[in-house]
Amino acid sequence: GSERTCCPVNWVEHERSCYWFSRSGKAWADADNYCRLEDAHLVVVTSWEEQKFVQHHIGPVNTWMGLHDQNGPWKWVDGTDYETGFKNWRPEQPDDWYGHGLGGGEDCAHFTDDGRWNDDVCQRPYRWVCETELDKASQEPPLL
């Protein structure tokens, strides 16, 4: 397909990527599916600068990102290396806490109210951020 040269309607351009910020909540997997159907992915934070950009747009609200350890090790949804990459966890996080009483631990990462990261139960209906890089196959999600 043709290359995407500008961001779709209702998406925000920043540093050659496009971002879409939800204003309502979904479970992590459903948020992930939404982004993928838009030829995007849950946001992958690769720098302090990108962290501040996303934080500015989401405000003090729990918001899913594209980081999980549902299959063991922590992984970014786009394959970005977790071990060597940017991290911004809250102190003593991630802790895979089992005390929430919902079954299992905590396998999905989200921005907390101060922007730092926490792991939480993936079924919680948090807001989310989609990201897609410019110069990928073009798609402009329309307005209803």
């Epitope: 397909g1 043709s2 939800s22 204003r23 309502s24 909540g25 979904k26 479970a27 997997a29 459903d30 948020a31 599916n33 939404y34 993928r36 159907l37 838009e38 030829d39 209906p125 989310w128 990928k136 196959a137 073009s138 798609q139 402009e140 999600p141 329309p142 307005l143 209803l144």
Partner: antibody, heavy 121, light 107 residues
């Protein structure tokens, strides 16, 4: 005119295959995710498959997983559904539908008229 | 998957009357709910999206309300062309699912 037109339905024996097509016109096809939705005779609607605008991401209902494959050719403005290992319970009218994103949901804002698939010996 | 239960299954009303259709979800779907109209031999048509927003070209007599698990489609004054089957659909959780439908028939 903005429209979707399905084709490829017909009578097929159990275990057989069919390939449905959906020709899109009047809008920029590659801008939209697309879905297939089916309706058994006298029954309700059932989502079957979905595909992103580029074709890079696909999803299938558990009832058809491993048997049906959704694909698209954006150069031809056409959506496809390859149906293998067909069963009697796959008998239905198959609609293609356009997925319009709004506030985090994909709503089917444009539908074709459907094509009937009958699986019977 | 989320189960949507529509009631009543059939609604018998006269033109000019008010129709109230219900859709209940087995768990919260927030406002990720749509309503579709389907006439015999035709494809469904999107009426309402995001629980309460009318789709393009839909008359003002159609309105949607609700959030969480309980939703309502209201047709304020039935026109002859409104007699059809109405389906709700949730988009909160994968896979997207539909209710079983409510048939609005002429009394």
């Amino acid at each position: 005119e903005v429209q979707l037109l399905e084709s490829g339905g017909g009578l097929v024996q159990p275990g057989g295959s069919l390939r449905l097509s959906c020709a899109a016109s009047g809008f920029t096809f590659s801008n939209y995710a697309m879905s297939w939705v089916r309706q058994a005779p006298g029954k309700g609607l059932e989502w079957v498959s979905a595909i992103s605008g580029s074709g890079g991401s696909t999803y299938h209902a558990d009832s058809v997983k491993g048997r049906f494959t959704i694909s698209r050719d954006n150069s031809k403005n056409t959506l496809y559904l390859q149906m293998n290992s067909l069963r009697a319970e796959d008998t239905a009218v198959y609609y293609c539908a356009r997925d319009a994103p709004y506030r985090g949901g994909h709503y089917f804002d444009l539908w074709g008229r459907g094509t009937l698939v009958t699986v019977s010996s | 998957e989320i189960v949507l239960t529509q009631s009543p299954a059939t609604l018998s009303l006269s033109p000019g009357e008010r129709a109230t259709l219900s859709c209940r979800a087995s768990q919260s779907v927030s406002s990720y709910l749509a309503w579709y109209q389907q006439k015999p031999g035709q494809a469904p048509r999107l009426l309402i999206y995001d629980a309460s927003n009318r789709a393009t070209g839909i008359p003002a007599r159609f309105s949607g309300s609700g959030s969480g698990t309980d939703f309502t489609l209201t047709i304020s004054s039935l026109e002859p062309e409104d007699f059809a089957v109405y389906y709700c659909q949730q988009l909160a959780s994968w896979p997207p699912t539909f209710g079983g439908g409510t048939k609005v028939e002429i009394k």
